[in-house]
Every structure is written in structure tokens, then in C-alpha cells.
């Protein structure tokens, strides 16, 4: 079967890094400069991606795999395969159409990318604010206010010793 298949379609035997060359009687030719084929049996090679401008080359193109780009310092990748580069902001900021803007009160961003997110609402979990939030950091929630009432201890008292022969009440 293999022999029959290869005689019917010689292109099926062309490995990755080559293409089935009609100009050379359908023998497998190497992909030309700045192109690649990542799978076998190709009739053409794909043009290598070029990492220009704000993109920089993370991995060079080879005859069997495309180039991979990342972003120059001050920018970060967005999209599948780093299809876009977006400007970094500082922590405590978010990128808007007008550039980097500080997070509004009550929100924070602890990264150089992404949007400002609201501080955690500790009271929703019945807890209190232990450390206040900032533009760069979320609040830190602590024990519930009831746990902090006068006379309350954060240390659980030991269980009373049981006398033998008595079941617990």
C-alpha cells in the first residue's frame, strides 16, 4: 500500500522543511530562504514571520518552524502567538486610550499590564480589613470583627478535662 500511495502521490513523501516542487518533476525541494513547512506533503512553503518594530525575535525561523516573536522592553505580548504588543504601565496604573492612568481609589493593579480591579470587600466574607489597599496592592482581610471584640482571644482555649465515667454535655 505504501508503495502504491507514493507512486500515486509523490508529494505525500515530502518531509517537513520541503515542498513538492512542480518545477522539478514533483521531487521534494528545500523550502526557499525565509520560508518553512512544518508538516510533510506540502506543495508550498509558508513565509516566515518577521519580528519588526516593537516585536523582537524570540526564536529564528527554520526550514521546519516559523519564527516566534516577543515584545521589546516596555511592552508585553497580547493574543495568540504574540500577535500584538501592548505598552506596559507601572503597577498601580492601567492602560487607557490616553495612555497609562493611575488606578481610581478603591481599585488596584499589581502588574504592569491589565486593568485596575476593585479591592476585595472583606465584609462580604464577614471579615475586617487588616491592611488597607493601595493602588498597587489589594486589601488584606483579617479576622471577623466579632473575633476582635474585647475579651475575645484569637487563641482557642483548651477543652476542659473530662472526668471518667461522664459523657460530654
Amino acid at each position: 500500500f505504501e508503495r502504491t500511495r507514493s507512486l500515486q502521490d509523490p508529494c505525500s513523501n515530502c518531509p517537513a522543511g520541503t515542498f513538492c516542487d512542480n518545477n522539478r518533476n514533483q521531487i521534494c525541494s528545500p523550502c526557499p530562504p525565509n520560508s518553512f513547512s512544518s508538516a510533510g506533503g506540502q506543495r508550498t512553503c509558508d513565509i516566515c514571520r518577521q519580528c519588526k518594530g516593537v516585536f523582537r525575535t524570540r526564536k529564528e525561523c527554520s526550514s521546519t518552524s516559523n519564527a516566534e516573536c516577543d515584545c521589546t522592553p516596555g511592552f508585553h505580548c497580547l493574543g495568540a502567538g504574540c500577535s500584538m504588543c501592548e505598552q506596559d504601565c507601572k503597577q498601580g496604573q492601567e492602560l487607557t486610550k490616553k495612555g497609562c492612568k493611575d488606578c481610581c481609589f478603591g481599585t488596584f493593579n499589581d502588574q504592569k499590564r491589565g486593568i485596575c480591579r476593585p479591592w476585595t470587600n472583606c465584609s462580604l466574607d464577614g471579615k475586617s480589613v487588616l491592611v488597607n489597599g493601595t493602588k498597587e496592592r489589594d486589601v488584606v482581610c483579617g479576622p471577623s470583627p466579632a473575633d476582635l471584640s474585647p475579651g475575645a482571644s484569637s487563641v482557642t482555649p483548651p477543652a476542659p478535662a473530662r472526668e471518667p465515667g461522664h459523657s460530654p454535655q
Partner: nanobody, 121 residues
Framework: AVQLVESGGGLVQPGGSLRLSCAAS????????MGWYRQAPGKQREVVAL???????VYGDSVKGRFTISRDNAKNTVYLQMNSLKPEDTAVYYC???????????????WGQGTQVTVSS
């Protein structure tokens, strides 16, 4: 033009090794890729191994892991180290040089005269 001279073929037992050489002379500046193809009687010419001027290598599926292509730029020579040879590797092995990619095809396409490799006990 480019002249290609192959050497190193011969008779070898299954499991044995051979090293083919292909020496290029002439207008070698025009060459982008060099490599080896083989043709057994009644079969199509198939790619064995290729190496580009940038150093990328490609191998035919049937020889991966057994054959290694390399080059010596100073000597303008390409080598094919063939290990763990099998009877099905028996063929005439041709050296090929390609260059001048223009308008969707290679302008320069040079072939050696071929060297016979026979794998038999």
C-alpha cells in the same frame, strides 16, 4: 556553473555504515541548499537529507535517526553519514545543489553523477 563530485558509495552489510561525500566547485556562491537524493530501480527519486546555507537540516522520514548530513564550508563539501544501513537503503545516491530562488522556483539546479550504495549480506 557548479560541478558536484560524489564519492564513498559501495557494498555494505546490513547494520553497517558508509560516509558519502559531495565536493562542489565552480560558482558555489549561488548555492542555497545542498543535499542527497536517492533512486532505487523502478522508484521515484526521493529526498534523503538536505542542508541549507543557514544550517537548517531536513531528513526523509525513512532515514531519520540513522543518517546525518553535515558540511565543511572550507572544503565546499557536504557529507552524508549513513549508519544502521538496511537493504531498503540500496539505491543510487545523488548529490544536489540548489540556488537562486526567483519567481517561485530555483534558478540553479545541479546534480552529481550518482554513487551506488548496496546493502546486502
Amino acid at each position: 556553473a557548479v560541478q558536484l563530485v560524489e564519492s564513498g558509495g559501495g557494498l555494505v552489510q546490513p547494520g553497517g555504515s558508509l560516509r558519502l561525500s559531495c565536493a562542489a566547485s565552480g560558482s558555489i556562491f549561488s548555492i542555497y541548499a545542498m543535499g542527497w537524493y536517492r533512486q532505487a530501480p523502478g522508484k521515484q527519486r526521493e529526498v534523503v537529507a538536505l542542508i541549507t546555507s543557514g544550517g537548517s537540516t531536513v531528513y526523509g522520514d525513512s532515514v531519520k535517526g540513522r543518517f546525518t548530513i553535515s558540511r565543511d564550508n572550507a572544503k565546499n563539501t557536504v557529507y552524508l553519514q549513513m549508519n544502521s544501513l538496511k537493504p531498503e537503503d540500496t539505491a543510487v545516491y545523488y548529490c544536489n545543489a540548489l540556488g537562486g530562488w526567483e519567481n517561485g522556483k530555483y534558478k540553479y539546479d545541479y546534480w552529481g553523477q550518482g554513487t551506488q550504495v548496496t546493502v546486502s549480506s
